[in-house]
Interface confidence: medium
């Protein structure tokens, strides 16, 4: 019968010829009277036999990414009577693996949005690299995920890759990060080799500004002819959030003498100054109000933000008309 | 420091002019509404005449509107009163004021100038 | 214009008692709009109270100001000798007008 063991090579050799084992028959007792032959694919190219010995030898670099294993014949012939000693058999040379590839991230571009002021811990996006040696051979292709550029915001699980918050942000300092995750093959081991991608993490805004006037005080005039309902002037208040936690409301929130009103254009999130009663020069020729701003929408667990309403006070001066 | 501190005072005959100048330091001057305020000789105070930060608006109490008028210069921090047709009434120590800026009260004065209007 | 009354004209108290100061209006006055100024002798008034109730930056908490419409008052609790001054009301809602002044002298 065949004897022989199983046969490994390892990839990437660089020497001309690797013995890579002895395929023989129980039979040959080593007089050279038997011939051994190699058929299949790589035969004669990739691999060739000693056809004294059986000796089998790798005459070409393999990369066990492209190809794993290869399937063979064997046979074994008298020479003198041209038969065949022993049936001809199959038998198998596995590639063994070397970890020559580094870990690649296969989904970039990775992005990813947040909401701003999220907790630690929060979850923020999975990357995952492959690494295209041999899972089951020793560590080549066991990844460790490490952080590059992100602290103190962000951190990664070594070996999920998962990215989660470590450090509250503020979309209104800082509206978006970019990560670098490096994946590093050999679990860090000397040899290892790393592949890099790069996260862009954006903050999606959350309503944790309140609306501030731009000034403490405004001053405006109204004419004593002018009738109810004029608009005498606008005040304006900036929030730093944006769209819809941007939207504000203006208010009164004192006037004695009940004259005034202000009203909000949503569009120009500005409040609009209303007369509300006429006015009489000889009677009050001025006027001092304070308004009030807030939020449109501010959600239940954001309201530690918006606890005092910024207020301004506005000065208002009657403009005296002669009367016939 | 935070002050005012008027000058330009002095004795006229009435009918006379007079250019009353209040030097303000330590605050941001251009922010704030002013005024002149007057007290006569053992009496009390009288309110003279207001300007706007911006020197937009200026309003006169009656006893001196088209008589007097005040005017500012920010860039030299300064506020001015130009009397005119001066009467022995008019005789007072003259007070620059700062109003606050929430409200028409004063909260900064300066030490005051004498005007003696006298024949 | 509206008129500011105070009284008494002059108030003669000793150092330790309590002075009460009145102000009254010829209409009503928002109380957002009344102010009380000590004024010494030579020297420039002084704000002590504003919106008729709100002690000014510095001013010692033995002032205090109170009243509404046309009747308001400043209290001194406890007179000190650096007390003793004129005491002007004003109001700020229709103009500027001042009271005539309340004298506290030492008895």
């Known amino acids: 019968g065949w004897v022989w063991n199983q046969f490994f090579v390892p990839e990437e050799m660089n020497t001309t010829s690797h013995h890579i084992g002895q395929l023989r028959s129980d039979l040959d007792n080593g007089n050279n009277s038997f011939q051994y032959k190699l058929l299949g694919a790589g035969a004669g190219s990739t691999f060739i036999i000693d056809e004294r010995t059986g000796d089998i030898y790798a005459i070409q670099k393999l990369d066990r990414e492209e190809r794993s294993l290869y399937i063979l014949r064997a046979q074994v012939i008298d020479i003198a009577t041209g038969r065949a000693v022993e049936p001809e058999s199959e038998f198998v040379i596995k590639v063994s693996d070397i970890n020559d590839n580094e870990p690649k991230f296969l989904d970039e571009p990775y992005e990813a949005i947040v909401p701003e002021m999220s907790p630690e811990g929060t979850l923020v996006i999975q990357v995952t690299a492959s690494d295209a040696d041999d899972p089951s051979s020793g560590n080549n292709a066991r990844l460790l995920y490490s952080l590059l550029q992100g602290q103190p915001y962000f951190s990664v699980e070594p070996t999920t890759g998962v990215i989660r918050i470590s450090s509250k942000m503020d979309r209104e300092l800082q509206d978006e990060y970019w990560v670098i995750i490096q994946a590093k093959d050999m679990i860090g081991q000397p040899g290892a080799l790393s592949g890099t991608t790069s996260v862009l993490i954006k903050l999606s805004d959350v309503n944790d500004n309140k609306p501030i006037f731009k000034e403490s005080l405004y001053r405006l005039t109204v004419s004593e002819s002018a009738p109810t309902g004029t608009s005498i002037g606008t005040i304006m208040a900036y929030d730093n959030d944006i769209g819809e936690n941007a939207e504000m409301d203006y208010s009164i929130e004192e006037d004695d003498s009940q004259t005034f009103d202000i009203i909000t254009n949503h569009e120009t999130q500005e409040g609009i100054v209303i007369l509300k009663k006429k006015v009489d020069f000889e009677h009050q020729n001025h006027y001092g109000i304070r308004a009030k701003v807030k939020n449109h929408h501010v959600p239940e667990q954001l309201m530690k933000y918006h606890t005092e309403a910024s207020t301004t006070f506005i000065k208002i001066q009657v403009e005296d008309v002669d009367e016939p | 420091q935070v002050q005012l501190v008027e000058s330009g005072g002095g004795v006229v005959q009435p009918g006379g002019s007079l250019r009353l100048s209040c030097a303000a330091s330590g605050f941001s001057f251009s922010s704030y509404d002013m005024d002149w305020v007057r007290q006569a000789p053992g009496k009390g105070l009288e309110w003279v005449a207001v300007?706007?930060?911006?020197?937009?608006?200026?309003y006169y109490a009656d006893s001196v509107r088209g008589r007097f008028t005040i005017s500012r210069d920010n860039s030299k921090n300064t506020l001015f009163l130009q009397m005119n047709s001066l009467r022995v009434e008019d005789t007072a120590v003259y007070y620059c004021?700062?109003?606050?800026?929430?409200?028409?009260?004063?909260?900064?004065w300066g030490q005051g100038t004498l005007v003696t209007v006298s024949s | 214009e509206i008129v500011l009354t105070q009284s008494p004209g002059t108030l003669s108290l000793s150092p330790g008692e309590r002075a009460t100061l009145s102000c009254r209006a010829s209409?009503?006055?928002?109380?957002?709009?009344l102010a009380w100024y000590q004024q010494k002798p030579g020297q420039a008034p002084r704000l002590l109270i504003y919106?008729?109730?709100s002690r000014a930056t510095g001013i010692p908490d033995r002032f205090s100001g109170s009243g509404s419409g046309t009747d308001f008052t400043l209290t001194i609790s406890r007179l000190e000798p650096e007390d003793f001054a004129v005491y002007y009301c004003q109001q700020y809602g229709s103009s500027w007008t001042f009271g005539q002044g309340t004298k506290v002298e030492i008895k």
């Open positions: 209409q009503s006055v928002s109380s957002s709009y």
């Open positions: 300007i706007w930060y911006d020197g937009s608006n200026k």
């Open positions: 919106g008729a109730s």
């Open positions: 004021a700062r109003e606050t800026g929430e409200g028409w009260y004063f909260d900064l």
